[in-house]
């Protein structure tokens, strides 16, 4: 069977070769070929070429669509690490340091304080804040951590809030707050973390972090 297939392939190849040679002869205007024959052969060849080109275009389109499909849903994720700051602001500062993540330019850390997204969609946003406080040294008010959203054309909005009472441990007791939820973000929206007393936040490795993930 294989031998017969081989003979068949060789015969087809020979026919193709003869066909190509005939086109060549037509082009050089050899007297032995009639004009009618040449016209027929030429139009046949043009048909083949057209088919080949159309196939090529289709493949190109499919490939570019695949690329677009991939581009439409790239992974968007960020995880940033807390940074001690001399600023008295209640907004926590973050840095791209240690074991951080910044998937691509569709999410950016702006002014060290907010994560800004370029694409609309549902995002899981989270923050862990570890703080060390003492009941006697602190005010009566609990330690509050807030996850806030600022979108273009809108006032900032609190998405999530958590409160912990101060520890009685001396000099201070470590406690952690974890906030996390799924929210619809618009292009240009920024999320940031606010705390009642930034001086009590622990910046040791792994204690305080902030991030998001596009679902």
């Amino acid at each position: 069977h294989r031998r017969l297939d081989k003979i068949e392939d060789e015969r087809n190849l020979h026919e193709d070769f003869v066909f190509m040679k005939t086109i060549q002869r037509c082009n050089t205007g050899e007297r032995s070929l009639s004009l009618l024959n040449c016209e027929e052969i030429k139009s046949q060849f043009e048909g083949f070429v057209k088919d080949i080109m159309l196939n090529k275009e289709e493949t190109k389109k499919e490939n570019s669509f695949e690329m677009q499909k991939g581009d439409q849903n790239p992974q968007i994720a960020a995880h940033v690490i807390s940074e001690a700051s001399s600023k008295t602001t209640s907004v926590l500062q973050w840095a791209e340091k240690g074991y951080y993540t910044m998937s691509n330019n569709l999410v950016t850390l702006e002014n060290g304080k907010q994560l800004t997204v370029k694409r609309q969609g549902l995002y899981y946003i989270y923050a862990q804040v570890t703080f060390c406080s003492n009941r006697e040294a602190s005010s009566q008010a609990p330690f509050i951590a807030s996850l806030c959203l600022k979108s273009p054309g809108r006032f900032e909005r609190i998405l999530l809030r958590a409160a912990n009472t101060h520890s009685s441990a001396k000099p201070c007791g470590q406690q952690s707050i974890h906030l996390g939820g799924v929210f619809e973000l618009q292009p240009g929206a920024s999320v940031f973390v606010n705390v009642t007393d930034p001086s009590q936040v622990s910046h040791g490795t792994g204690f305080t972090s902030f991030g998001l993930l596009k679902l």
Partner: antibody, heavy 119, light 107 residues
Framework: EVKLVESGGGLVKPGGSLKLSCTTS????????MSWVRQTPEKRLEWVAS???????YYPDSVRGRFTISRDNARNILYLQMSSLRSEDTAMYYC?????????????WGQGTSVTVSS | DIQMTQSPASLSASVGETVTITCRAS??????LAWYQQKQGRSPQLLVY???TLAEGVPSRFSGSGSGTQFSLKINSLQPEDFGSYYC?????????FGTGTKLELK
């Protein structure tokens, strides 16, 4: 039905103080950003102050340091404490609710309270 | 600060006519523009936000258009209750600023 009712306006001397109130009903007050907007005698509208649902406050340069916006979520009241008043603060003061909780556009306005600063 | 320039300052028209009021921002505000109507002795009322979205209860004869820095409010087939003053306001960022107003009077 959303209702906003301003009060506390009146005649005050330059350098004096006044506290405006806006009593609200018909919506969940603490979920919305609220603002004060004034209309001058020449009918120009000027933004005066805003407070977000998270209690962040915003002011234009013309009133920053002189005016303070605050809210009492338990009583559904918005306040504007005005001090060091000037003649250019003379206007009709409106309180307004922000559309869709936190948009900068304002969908409901009160009937206004008049403030005149004059010696 | 973003300056909002409104024109014309005043306009006379008859019932049934179509009028257009324009508003220009000193820098791009994308589609963050609102239009308000104020009748004599009353408080302003939101007509349009996000440049073209009609507020609840606003008749369809009102329409907003534009983006970037150029915006317009069109009122088709004017009704007696449409006469009054109209203000644009950018709602892109703070400070919030309003246009100077357009007084629409009955011809």
């Amino acid at each position: 039905e959303v209702k906003l009712v301003e009060s506390g306006g009146g005649l005050v001397k330059p350098g004096g103080s006044l506290k405006l109130s806006c009593t609200t009903s018909g919506f969940t007050f603490n979920n919305y950003a609220m603002s004060w907007v004034r209309q001058t005698p020449e009918k120009r509208l000027e933004w005066v102050a805003s407070i977000s649902s998270g209690d962040s406050t915003y002011y234009p340069d013309s009133v920053r340091g002189r005016f303070t916006i605050s809210r009492d979520n338990a009583r559904n009241i918005l306040y504007l404490q005005m001090s060091s008043l000037r003649s250019e603060d003379t206007a009709m003061y409106y309180c307004a609710r922000h559309y869709d909780y936190d948009s900068y556009a304002m969908d409901y306005w009160g009937q206004g309270t008049s403030v005149t600063v004059s010696s | 600060d973003i300056q909002m320039t409104q024109s014309p300052a005043s306009l006379s028209a008859s019932v049934g006519e179509t009028v257009t009021i324009t508003c220009r921002a000193s820098e791009t505000i994308y589609s963050y523009l609102a239009w308000y109507q104020q009748k004599q002795g009353r408080s302003p009322q939101l007509l349009v936000y996000n440049a073209k979205t009609l507020a609840e209860g606003v008749p369809s004869r009102f329409s907003g258009s534009g983006s970037g820095t150029q915006f317009s409010l069109k009122i088709n087939s004017l009704q007696p209750e449409d006469f009054g003053s109209y203000y644009c306001q950018h709602h892109y960022n703070t400070p919030l600023t309003f246009g100077t107003g357009t007084k629409l009077e009955l011809k």
